[in-house]
């Protein structure tokens, strides 16, 4: 039977070493058995890649293609292959569709006048166009009250958070994560890092009396 | 040591046809992508063609396209440049050239970083 | 395409001295930060050409630190400091951003 594409590939770039496509089949499909994605820098001289997906889901395919240190002006071109039959070409401009890495490391440690102090690593080196745009979004949320959540926009450089432990409910047991955006890229959100949970041993004044 | 060896050239009549050649040795051809620049009598540089490292992608100059052919055979370490429908004003020495590192996602560049001697090519009746 | 100009045409210059060749194009040969492709070649009298400056300012393999490349965009200079009589020859600059590559006309430097 022919093969079709139902939602043709999204990509996004970590502007630093990987782009992701992913993209649906109309049915189920054996994505690295039967697809081929090829991608080219329109640049002088670049050769053609070839990314082999991988299931994501039973018609759901993904690629992951490594790619240099990105820059405003790259623009790869991709083709979506099965076999010899061309399913898709696009092109694809890294800086116009980034995605920034994970921000990684999120800890939590008291710190002086009942406070909590949340701490994560920036997932850019220095020398990274992104390590300076990033702000970041934090959630925190009861783990026994779903309704006890709150979410903190970090707007400053920092990769911290301070978090007096008089907003939290004494004695309950709290989980964080953070996920991060580059404004100037106009990015989409990262994905959310791995939570790290705590428990808010802050005494009410009120009991203290 | 770096070394590029042209040969095939010739005088021929417009019209005719000739086969460049251009042998490689010091460096990993197959990375690099190779070029041709002529240079008529007493005139200045002109680019000709540029063919990548797997050979997979070819440009040309307006005024050969059509005409000329770029190729190359890594298993030889040799350019080729074939030359069809010769014009007068093909005239000239034809130096082939290394260029940008294209194994890797973005080309590298190092300018035309090492040239060959060069081979003449007479176009005339 | 792109068009380089190269200026001047001709240039005499004593020994010691310092030569200045200028060289514009009609497109910006800036492709990202600190990559402009723009090179600069010199051809000796009877010989084939050979590097002295890509990417606008980075010198070549073996190119004395008397050759000097600067420049962004769309405006290069290539300055050659305590000019020697072995530095006679014509010079181009190039772009080799995109294809047709094109070179500028060429200055001629004679060694007074």
């Known amino acids: 039977g022919s093969v079709k594409v139902l939602h043709e590939p999204s990509c996004f770039s970590d502007y630093i070493s990987t782009s992701v496509c992913q993209w649906k089949m109309d049915h189920p499909t054996n994505c690295s058995a039967e697809l081929r994605l090829s991608y080219q820098l329109d640049f002088m001289g670049s050769e053609n890649h070839t990314c082999v997906p991988e299931n994501r889901e039973d018609s759901v395919c993904v690629c992951s293609m490594p790619i240099d240190d990105a820059v405003e002006a790259d623009v790869y071109q991709l083709d979506l292959w099965a076999g010899q039959q061309l399913l898709w070409s696009g092109s694809f401009q890294p800086s116009k569709h980034v995605k920034p890495r994970t921000p990684g490391n999120l800890t939590v440690h008291p710190n002086i006048s009942h406070t909590w102090l949340l701490m994560w690593t920036n997932p850019y080196p220095t020398e990274n166009h992104l390590h300076s745009e990033l702000t970041y979004m934090v959630n925190v949320s009861n783990d026994n009250d779903p309704e006890d959540f709150k979410v903190y926009n970090v707007t400053y450089m920092g990769p911290t958070l301070r978090l007096a432990a008089s907003t939290l409910k004494s004695g309950a047991s709290y989980s964080a994560r953070v996920r991060a955006w580059a404004q100037t890229y106009n990015s989409t959100w990262s994905d959310w890092s791995p939570s790290t949970t705590w428990l808010n041993y802050y005494e009410p004044w009120e009991q203290h009396l | 040591e770096v070394q590029l060896v042209e040969s095939g050239g010739d005088l021929v009549k417009p019209g005719g046809s000739l086969r460049l050649s251009c042998v490689a040795s010091?460096?990993?051809?197959?990375?690099?992508?190779m070029t041709w620049v002529r240079q008529a009598p007493g005139k200045g540089l002109q680019w000709v063609s540029l063919?990548?490292?797997?050979?997979?992608?070819?440009y040309y100059a307006d005024a050969v396209k059509g005409r000329f052919t770029i190729s190359r055979d890594n298993a030889k370490n040799t350019l080729y440049l074939q030359m069809n429908s010769l014009r007068a004003e093909d005239t000239a020495v034809y130096y082939c050239a290394v260029d940008r590192l294209t194994k890797t996602i973005r080309p590298q560049y190092y300018g035309m970083w090492s040239w060959g001697q060069g081979t003449l090519v007479t176009v005339s009746s | 395409d792109i068009v380089m100009t190269q200026t001047p045409l001709s240039l005499s210059v004593s020994p010691g001295e310092t030569a200045s060749i200028s060289c514009r194009s009609s497109?910006?040969?800036?492709?990202?930060?600190?990559?402009?492709?723009l090179d600069w070649y010199l051809q000796k009298p009877g010989q084939s050409p050979q590097g002295l400056i890509y990417l606008g300012s980075k010198r070549a393999s073996g190119v004395p630190d008397r050759f000097s490349g600067s420049g962004s965009g769309t405006d290069f200079t290539l300055r050659i400091s305590r000019v020697e009589a072995n530095d006679t020859g014509v010079y181009y600059c190039?772009?080799?951003?995109?294809?047709?590559?094109?070179f500028g006309q060429g200055t001629k430097l004679e060694i007074k």
């Open positions: 063919i990548n490292g797997s050979g997979g992608k070819t």
């Open positions: 190039m772009q080799g951003l995109q294809s047709p590559l094109t």
């Open positions: 497109q910006s040969l800036l492709y990202s930060i600190g990559y402009n492709y």
């Open positions: 010091g460096f990993t051809f197959r990375d690099y992508a």
